[in-house]
């Protein structure tokens, strides 16, 4: 069952997904000049069994020098056109482990993909919150939303997570200070990324990720 | 709940132009494609376009290619279709719908083209 | 691009029979993006089904959804006088996104 909308926004904060529940979708988009090999697939998604989740299809993208179907509808300034440069860098990573049985791992870079990774969750599935560079995050309660259905329709549990704005940052463990706004868009478009591509999931954070990731960040 | 609520009816003379407004409230806007589709009188359904608001880049069926622009405004949470030198068989009702799997829909415009 | 075929074109049946409606894609590979619609006249398309088996918000439990591969049914299982409507087909799987040409399900 899929999630009807997205994680809830926290002002000054961006959230992401450490593993991705079997059937969760990702879009399947292209950077500008770019458009999806002719009828390539539009999304890919996380499937398995007992054993494995893997990715199935694969993002495709390709010069749309060519006359074809995809369109620029307006102009981007230079430093949106391209992910950050950590992102595309970062090592492959294999899709066909998961560290948490039914999920699966970040899909690793394509070529050309887009500024934006656009994922479809489902029931279930849980995402993290941080602060943006330059909050401070104060927490009543867990910092992360959960999926739920409830009489037959979904929605996200609220986190527990104000962002201050001090010069100090809550920070993904492992991961370096984010950028306060990703490849300079506005605050008011941040609140919401996953900007994922270049996290590696760890393997001694998965155990214990389900229950009290991140407290030794709030305490 | 997210809704869609579109502009209303026109009548066009063949050869003009005609822009259809789709106003979502009540969820994300800009992360989620919104879709175009078609139905002239006693027709099926066809797939015009789509745009994903926050890429601010639009697809489109070959056969509207040179025809229509699909455009978003993040600010109003509003989508755009436009559809250019207008002729007769273009006399539709005109949906935009949220998501690849259509949910949910506007409640439909009607383009009238006659001269 | 993906054409899917529906059938039959026409359905007469009564209500509290059970309807299958089928639909047939030229390519596989599209059975987690195979939706189902009802359309009624005047009204925009409702969905119903999407992921060839997921029942989308507020449908009753007697419209299910199955297939994989190339093949996909859409069943209802004890028709009520409301179900009778025109059901669609779509595959989002690639683009072009692409409908059937529908079915038309009437009272006998």
């Known amino acids: 069952e899929l999630c009807d909308d997205d994680p809830p926004e926290i002002p000054h904060a961006t959230f992401k997904a450490m593993a991705y529940k079997e059937g969760t979708m990702l879009n399947c988009e292209c950077k500008r000049g770019f458009r999806r090999i002719k009828s390539g697939s539009l999304y890919m998604l996380c499937t398995g069994n007992s054993s494995h989740s893997s990715w199935d299809n694969q993002c495709q993208c390709t010069s749309s020098a060519t006359r074809n179907t995809t369109k620029q509808v307006t102009p981007q300034p230079e430093e949106q056109k391209e992910r950050k440069t950590t992102e595309m860098q970062s090592p492959m990573q294999p899709v066909d482990q998961a560290s948490l049985p039914g999920h699966c791992r970040e899909p690793p870079p394509w070529e050309n993909e887009a500024t934006e990774r656009i994922y479809h969750f489902v029931v279930g599935q849980m995402v993290y919150y941080q602060c943006v560079q330059g909050y401070r995050a104060l927490h009543r309660g867990p910092a992360e939303s959960v999926c739920k259905m409830t009489h037959g329709k979904t929605r996200w549990t609220q986190p527990q997570l104000i962002c201050t704005g001090e010069m100090e940052t809550s920070q993904f463990p492992g991961e370096e200070k984010p950028q306060a706004s990703p490849e300079g868009r506005p605050e008011s478009e941040t609140s919401c990324l996953v900007t994922t591509t270049d996290f590696q999931i760890q393997t001694e954070m998965a155990a214990t990720m389900e229950t009290s990731i991140f407290t030794t960040e709030y305490q | 709940q997210v809704q869609l609520v579109q502009s209303g009816a026109e009548v066009k003379k063949p050869g003009s132009s005609v822009k259809v407004s789709c106003k979502a409230s009540?969820?994300?806007?800009?992360?989620?494609?919104i879709n175009w589709v078609r139905q002239a009188p006693g027709q099926g359904l066809e797939w015009m376009g789509r745009i994903i608001p926050i890429l601010d880049i639009a697809d489109y069926a070959q056969k509207f290619q040179d025809r229509v622009t699909i455009t978003a405004d993040k600010s109003t949470n509003t989508a755009y279709m436009e559809l250019s030198s207008l002729r007769s068989e273009d006399t539709a009702v005109y949906y935009c719908a949220r998501k690849d799997w259509f949910d949910p829909w506007g409640q439909g415009t009607l383009v009238t083209v006659s001269s | 691009e993906n054409v899917l075929t529906q059938s039959p074109g026409t359905l007469s049946l009564s209500p509290g029979e059970r309807a299958t409606l089928s639909c047939r894609a030229s390519?596989?590979?599209?059975?987690?993006?195979l939706a189902w619609y009802q359309q009624k006249p005047g009204q925009a398309p409702r969905l119903l089904i999407y992921?060839?088996?997921s029942r989308a918000t507020g449908i009753p439990d007697r419209f299910s959804g199955s297939g994989s591969g190339t093949d996909f049914t859409l069943t209802i299982s004890r028709l009520e006088p409301e179900d009778f409507a025109v059901y669609y087909c779509q595959q989002y799987g690639s683009s072009p996104i692409t409908f059937g040409q529908g079915t038309r399900l009437e009272i006998k």
């Open positions: 009540g969820g994300t806007f800009s992360r989620y494609a």
């Open positions: 390519q596989s590979g599209s059975s987690s993006y």
């Open positions: 992921g060839a088996s």
